[in-house]
């Protein structure tokens, strides 16, 4: 017979020879990292028809790492379903807990023994330190020193000393989230008041108010014969300015160079867009580009 068969899990005892006589026996043993469980034979004989009698390595089993229990408030998941060496054990924590240690352990061979690559991790409760205090405002549960996962606080602004109230800029409610950090930055309490939006040759059509505080929204339309240059809707933003800027109502030109829009409230933009100041003083109609619009 020629050289005996080779296997993944077992190896020949002694040195292989190029040829074997009929009736000659060879013995195998389980390779390093494998162990033998009877009764399957681990030897073979050169048969008279010059082939080896059937033999397999199915009696050799991979060395196994010890079973690891799920961590408290978490779970250990075998990546390939067994504890044999080469296995990966993935650890995850339940919601509201975070992992201390390695999130993957590997089943490795040390000499002839299969052991895990490290200590199993722990799942600790997610805790947050108190959220930031803010100027001109406060948050609920200000007396609490430790917050658990998903515990929420709500911010509110103090009454303002003057005639205009403080506006809360940002998220009013934040919660203790992953990584023991708060879900959002603390908001800000400050007076946000936009100026009265003046539009020459037009007027406000919605969002009327005594004063215009944070997030106040105003809409405009232009007089007949004028069209809107800019947005018809503006919002009072946290820096006390309108965004987009207060629009302008420009005269519809009847000169042949400019096509007149059909609507008084909107229409094509002029080729040159005059700059719109932040608020609300616009160039006089007898200055600059507005000349030819008035012709």
């Amino acid at each position: 017979c020629e050289a005996p068969p080779t296997f993944e899990a077992m190896e020949l005892i002694g040195k292989p020879k190029p040829y074997y006589r009929v009736g000659e026996r060879v013995d195998y043993k389980c390779k390093k990292g494998y162990f033998y469980i009877p009764p399957l034979a681990t030897h073979t004989i050169c048969d008279r028809n010059h082939t080896w009698l059937p033999v397999s390595d199915e009696g050799c089993y991979r060395e196994m790492c010890p079973h690891i229990r799920d961590p408290l408030n978490g779970e250990a998941i075998l990546a390939n379903g067994s504890y044999e060496f080469g296995a990966e054990l993935h650890f995850i924590c339940n919601e509201g807990y975070y992992l201390i240690g390695k999130d993957i352990l590997y089943c490795e061979l040390k000499d002839t023994v299969a052991i895990w690559s490290g200590k199993p991790p722990l799942c600790e409760k997610i805790l947050c330190t108190p959220p930031p205090k803010i100027k001109n405002g406060k948050h609920t549960f200000s007396e609490v020193e430790v917050f658990e996962y998903l515990d929420a606080v709500t911010y509110s602004c103090d009454p303002a000393p003057g005639p205009d109230p403080f506006s809360l800029i940002g998220e009013s409610m934040i919660y203790c989230g992953n990584n023991s950090t708060w879900s959002h930055a603390a908001p800000e309490c400050k007076v946000v008041k936009c100026r009265f939006p003046v539009v020459e040759n037009g007027k406000q059509i919605s969002g009327f108010g005594k004063k215009f505080y944070y997030k106040a929204t105003v809409m405009f339309e232009c007089d007949k014969g004028y069209y809107l240059n800019g947005s018809d809707k503006i919002v009072c933003e946290s820096n006390s300015t309108w965004d987009p800027p207060v629009p302008k109502c420009l005269k519809v030109s009847t000169s042949p160079t400019t096509k007149s829009p059909t609507s008084s409230a909107s229409g094509p933009r002029p080729t040159y867009k005059p700059p719109v100041s932040n608020y609300p003083g616009y160039p006089k109609p007898d200055e600059g580009i507005l000349n030819n619009l008035d012709d």
Epitope: K193, C194, R195, F196, V198, V199, E200, N201, G202, K203, Q204, F208, K210, K211, S277, N278, Y279, P280, G281, Y282, P283, K284
Partner: antibody, heavy 118, light 107 residues
């Protein structure tokens, strides 16, 4: 609290020009939006125009071609330049601080009298 | 321009009377209306802004109401110091305009 004081009024002939001043004390004129308003027995109170903190202006179109509002920050003064004056321009002229960016007038000065007569 | 028409043009009241002045706009002005009082020999002074908000220092016997085109200034119990000319002013649209005034006298 800023105080606004008008000056420059007087007698002027029809067709003449006059520049009224509005001097600010206790604050910067450039920090406030300043309107000019006039009052006469025949025409009552009339708003003439405004100069905003950013230097932009809006006018009452009835006076736009003859009246110009400006400001000199170094002199801390706002101005109303009036040209081609008519007899019906005879009035007391007030400069007014627009209330915190809102068009209501809470800070009236004593005004300055302009008389247009030949 | 938006016209404001005040009525009556003048009235005479006794101290303690309730006085009502109306201001009608030629088109809708939402609540963008102010009231002023010009006492004899003085400059005008702001009484009420945004239809019904009392300016600081103004006695609470003054009140304003209305919306759209029709507005009212009420003095619940008129006093001798309330004499003068009352003006309304709109600011929804340029040019900002004033009413012609209502003269209030004490009998």
């Amino acid at each position: 609290e800023v105080q606004l004081v008008e000056s420059g009024g007087g007698l002027v002939q029809p067709g003449g020009s006059l520049r009224l001043s509005c001097a600010a004390s206790g604050g910067s004129v450039s920090s406030y939006d300043i309107s000019w308003i006039r009052q006469s027995p025949s025409r009552g109170l009339e708003w003439l125009g405004v100069i905003w903190t950013d230097g932009g202006t809006n006018y009452n179109s009835a006076f736009m071609s003859r009246f110009t509002i400006s400001r000199d920050d170094s002199k801390n003064t706002a101005y109303l330049q009036m040209n081609s004056l008519k007899t019906e321009d005879t009035a007391v002229y007030y400069c007014e601080r627009v209330y915190d960016g809102y068009p209501w007038f809470a800070y009236w000065g004593q005004g300055t009298l302009v008389t247009v007569s030949s | 321009a938006i016209q404001l028409t005040q009525s009556p043009s003048s009235l005479s009241a006794s101290v303690g009377d309730r006085v009502t002045i109306t201001c009608r706009a030629s088109q809708g002005i939402a609540n963008y209306l102010n009231w002023y009082l010009q006492k004899p020999g003085q400059s005008p002074q702001l009484l009420i802004y945004y239809t019904s908000s009392l300016h600081s220092g103004v006695p609470d016997r003054f009140s304003g109401s209305g919306s759209g085109t029709d507005f009212t200034l009420k003095i619940s119990r008129v006093e001798a110091e309330d004499v003068g000319v009352y003006y309304c002013q709109q600011y929804i649209k340029l040019p900002w305009t004033f009413g012609q005034g209502t003269k209030v006298e004490i009998k």
